[in-house]
């Protein structure tokens, strides 16, 4: 969490920033509030991307003001309109590109004064793993997949009943680039399992950490996967 | 430590080319655009051209356009100005500046240029 | 264009004085100006960006203001460090320009 104060001439404002990470391909959101006011038509919001010539976005006198926005963002940026006069600057960031990754800085001027804080935005791809057995191995295998990663994570198995114990023996993980040439699938192959075990396959890089746990017993199996973003800090 | 380094420059004669370069290190060159700035002998500062970081966009000042190229090289953090139909006017120190939030945060000492008979 | 003109165009002050020096852009630019110190030389070094943001290392006796038309340096006491040309520098649009410079002096 960022918050910044404004100085100099009027009053000072606080605005408060979360750094977040963008999954690319996907829309993204840049989160920035700041203390209301009650005239929306007094209200300017500027966003700022760090070694960027032309604006993010700006939003002033309750309309999009993009004339000078940089061509990088152009047909890409939206504030959330209806929720600016309860102080809420936050940029929806549409198809996050990897190149989107930087330091922004969210300014507002309201009537009461002004003020901006800092943000670091990330970007990268992360997807839930899905576990699954292998029929076709030879022995016991296990199989987690996730479709979009970059860049690339690490992936480390882990189990229930051995706990603490080195899988890295005994699995095998390769990396596939996909189509568009950045992102890559993530395969990992877990040999010699036991029945009656829950085993979890964590990937992750320095964006996000995802798991996906699956538990097999004679009788059934079950499946849950969870994602984390990593370093969401507010300013 | 951010560093630009210029290059390049030295006396040449009226209608003849030259091509600065601004060897940069310290910060994710690909990350910012990039500028350059002229100062004539004894006179104030005047903006010459500016590129995006991805070198997609370029903008020229109207004393230079259709002679200046800026282009930069992401691989080898360069930035370059290839300067063709050189002037008399043209005569200045160039610096590099390199862009923070929208102008330029960060400066190289600069290298003279004298276009000369 | 927009045209950007300080003044003075020379100050003579002494250590310890406060200093201001006026930029008045030729059309609003909002809050998008700059303030430079350069000495005999020398690289210019940002000072202040957007109007009134103070760049990280420069000390506080420098503060800018205004927005629009008409803009302000002030130093709130110089220092033997601070003697040196001043330029205001306008980023509205993608060409930039700058004022014509003031030098302050040792009166």
């Known amino acids: 969490l960022i918050i910044g104060f404004g100085i100099s001439g009027r009053h000072s404002i606080t605005v408060t920033t979360v750094a977040s990470a963008g999954n690319i391909g996907e829309d993204g959101i840049l989160s920035c509030t700041f203390e209301p006011d009650i005239k929306l038509s007094d209200i300017v919001i500027q966003w700022l991307k760090e070694g960027v010539l032309g604006l993010v976005h700006e939003f002033k006198e309750g309309k999009d003001e993009l004339s000078e926005q940089d061509e990088m963002f152009r047909g890409r940026t939206a504030v959330f309109a209806d929720q600016v006069i309860v102080g809420n600057a936050s940029l929806r960031l549409k198809n996050v590109q990897l190149t989107d990754a930087g330091t922004y800085k969210c300014y507002i001027i309201t009537s009461k004064g002004k003020g901006n804080a800092n943000l670091e935005y990330k970007t990268g791809a992360f997807s839930m793993p899905e576990v699954n057995v292998d029929y076709n191995a030879s022995s016991e295998t296990l199989r987690c997949e996730a479709p979009r990663w970059f860049p690339q994570p690490t992936v480390v198995w882990a189990s229930q009943v051995d706990q603490g114990a080195n899988f890295s023996e005994v699995s095998n993980t390769s990396f596939e680039l996909n189509s568009e040439n950045v992102t890559m699938k993530v395969v990992s192959v877990l040999y010699n399992v036991t029945i009656n075990n829950t085993y979890s396959c964590m990937i992750e890089n320095d964006i996000a950490k995802a798991t996906g746990d699956i538990k097999v017993t004679e009788s059934e199996i079950k499946r849950r996967s969870h994602l984390q973003l990593l370093n969401s800090k507010a300013s | 430590e951010v560093q630009l380094l210029e290059s390049g420059g030295g006396l040449v004669q009226p209608g003849g080319s030259l091509r600065l370069s601004c060897a940069a290190s310290?910060?994710?060159?690909?990350?910012?655009?990039m500028s350059w700035v002229r100062q004539a002998p004894g006179k104030g500062l005047e903006w010459v051209s500016s590129?995006?970081?991805?070198?997609?966009?370029?903008y020229y000042a109207d004393s230079v356009k259709g002679r200046f190229t800026i282009s930069r090289d992401n691989s080898k953090n360069t930035l370059s100005l290839q300067m063709n139909s050189l002037r008399a006017e043209d005569t200045a120190v160039y610096y590099c500046?390199?862009?923070?939030?929208?102008?330029?945060?960060?400066w190289g000492q600069g290298t003279l240029v004298t276009v000369s008979s | 264009d927009i045209q950007l003109t300080q003044s003075p165009s020379t100050l003579s002050a002494s250590v310890g004085d406060r200093v201001t020096i006026t930029c008045r852009a030729s059309q609003s630019i909002s809050s998008w100006l700059a303030w430079y110190q350069q000495k005999a030389g020398k690289a210019p070094k940002l000072l202040i960006y957007k109007a009134s943001d103070l760049e990280s290392g420069v000390p506080s006796r420098f503060s800018g203001s205004g927005s629009g038309i008409e803009f302000t340096l002030t130093i709130s006491s110089l220092q033997p460090d601070d003697f040196a040309t001043y330029y205001c520098q306008q980023y509205n649009s993608y060409s930039w320009t700058f004022g014509q410079g003031t030098k302050v002096e040792i009166k």
């Open positions: 500046a390199k862009v923070g939030w929208r102008t330029g945060d960060y």
């Open positions: 590129i995006s970081g991805n070198g997609g966009s370029t």
């Open positions: 310290g910060f994710t060159f690909s990350s910012y655009a």
